[in-house]
Amino acid sequence: AGTPEVWVQVQMEATELSSFTVHCGFLGPGSISLVTVSWGGPDGAGGTKLAVLHPELGTRQWAPARQARWETQSSISLALEDSGASSPFANTTFCCKFASFPEGSWESCGSLPPSSDPGLSAPPTPVPILRADLAGILGLSGVLLFGCGYLLHLLRRQKHRPTPRLQPSHTNSQALTAQAWAPSQASQAALHDPYATINTSFCPATLDTAHPNGWASLPTHAAHQPQGPAASASTPILARGSFVSVENGLYTQAGERPPHTGPGLTLFPDCRGPRALEGRFGVR
């Protein structure tokens, strides 16, 4: 099983140019306990919360968010109403943070592709998204053949590559940035020149939120090494300007629940300070 990933896609609505929708999804085996959508940067690092979605408690959203909803068990959408005439959303970064069990907290950011035509963005799917400016160049069959061939090639290459191991890290503040899966030259033209950067940051974990089953988060002492798309055939290629920031929080089971606990709260590894939440406090 590959490293969990988060994808983000920003779409401008074809009918109303002032309306935008942010789609986010989590690609991983764990169960999602909380999703936070922010704009202007990652949550807790200069970003402003737009919505918080709990899989059972409900959603909370704030202007300019119009409607936040779960699209599937592992993906959400957030409709935004742009009241301004100059459409500030077009140049804004939107970030989605998924707190999941047992993987921890994973965040990804993205913005509207610079050359995007309203309504042309394909809806997010759990398979690689092929974004071509010249859509007519590649027929559907060509795309499928190319995709299958490329996947087979990657899988064959993966067989001969040593498996990445967990790298122990003894510094909580350590950050590791690596270029991930640069697409081949042939595919770059067809794939709208996409790229993605995996940014793995290790933070002292604070119990901003805790798991419904009373699991607690400890400071991370190990991190997943980034893997390319060969690790998972269902990795979408992120639109240009996106990056994947992986905050890897390892969970350990707390012996007993705290005296006062809240519903299904999620643990977010967090670099904002030592204040810890003693309950399973989550986001609303």
């Epitope: 402003t48 919360k49 918080v52 709990h54 899989p55 059972e56 408690l57 409900g58 909370r60 959203q61 704030w62 202007a63 909803r69 779960w70 699209e71 599937t72 068990q73 993906s75 604070t206 119990l207 901003d208 939120t209 006062h260 809240g262 519903p263 709260l265 977010f268 967090d270 904002r272 300070g273 204040r275 939440l277 003693e278 309950g279 406090f281 989550g282 986001v283 609303r284």
Partner: antibody, heavy 114, light 113 residues
Framework: EVQLVQSGAEVKKPGSSVKVSCKAS????????IEWVRQAPGQGLEWIGE????????NYNEKFKGRVTFTADESTSTAYMELSSLRSEDTAVYYC???????WGQGTLVTVSS | DIVMTQSPDSLAVSLGERATINCKSS????????????LAWYQQKPGQPPKLLIY???TRESGVPDRFSGSGSGTDFTLTISSLQAEDVAVYYC?????????FGQGTKLEIK
């Protein structure tokens, strides 16, 4: 332990304003909304609105728009609800709550009487 | 706004017997995307704030005794106390957690017969 501690009971004249405080502890204050709910004597629960500390983003129940103001002070982890143009029917216990109504303050009784 | 209607308004049940409270919403509380029902149940004792018992229509909050259970989907929901205890005497509220504004039922007063 997550705690929400509210200010004490208030007696107000019709037409005046009241400001109720709610001090949060045990979690990162800016992470979650503070909700405000009221309960008139012998009646049910009525949502007034919410504020997200940090960004100070708010949502209001239409019924209270224009009469209620939410503020939050991150330095003291305290949220405030101010209700103006008070009338006798605003007599109620006012609660602050957080995290999808999982945590509640003890309530503040506001009595509006001439 | 979604209107939440509870029945009955009051209920008297003998100790050890089953108590059932119903809640009906004016719109569906089911999110088709993740197939979750956004309904919560609260218990309120005199002089105290409400206490969350059940969320997601059927998920019991941590620390809530397993005699409390929630069921239902869409617009019709039920809170069941399988064996009534003296400490369960309270007013129970259902709440729409599906969409703004959050709305509560009028409450059901549960007493011992």
């Amino acid at each position: 332990e997550v705690q929400l501690v509210q200010s004490g009971a208030e007696v107000k004249k019709p037409g005046s304003s009241v400001k109720v405080s709610c001090k949060a502890s045990g979690y990162t204050f800016s992470s979650f909304s503070i909700e405000w709910v009221r309960q008139a004597p012998g009646q049910g629960l009525e949502w007034i609105g919410e504020i997200l500390p940090g960004s100070n983003s708010t949502n209001y129940n239409e019924k209270f728009k224009g009469r209620v103001t939410f503020t939050a002070d991150e330095s003291t982890s305290t949220a405030y609800m101010e209700l103006s143009s008070l009338r006798s029917e605003d007599t109620a216990v006012y609660y602050c709550s957080s995290y999808w109504f999982a945590y509640w303050g003890q309530g503040t009784l506001v009595t509006v009487s001439s | 706004d979604i209107v939440m209607t509870q029945s009955p308004d009051s209920l008297a049940v003998s100790l050890g017997e089953r108590a059932t409270i119903n809640c009906k919403s004016s719109q569906s509380l089911l999110n088709s995307g993740n197939q979750k029902n956004y309904l919560a149940w609260y218990q309120q004792k005199p002089g105290q704030p409400p206490k969350l018992l059940i969320y997601g229509a059927s998920t019991r909050e941590s620390g809530v005794p397993d005699r409390f259970s929630g069921s239902g989907s869409g617009t019709d929901f039920t809170l069941t106390i399988s064996s009534l205890q003296a400490e369960d005497v309270a007013v129970y509220y259902c709440q729409n957690a599906h969409s703004y504004p959050p709305t509560f039922g009028q409450g059901t007063k549960l007493e011992i017969k």
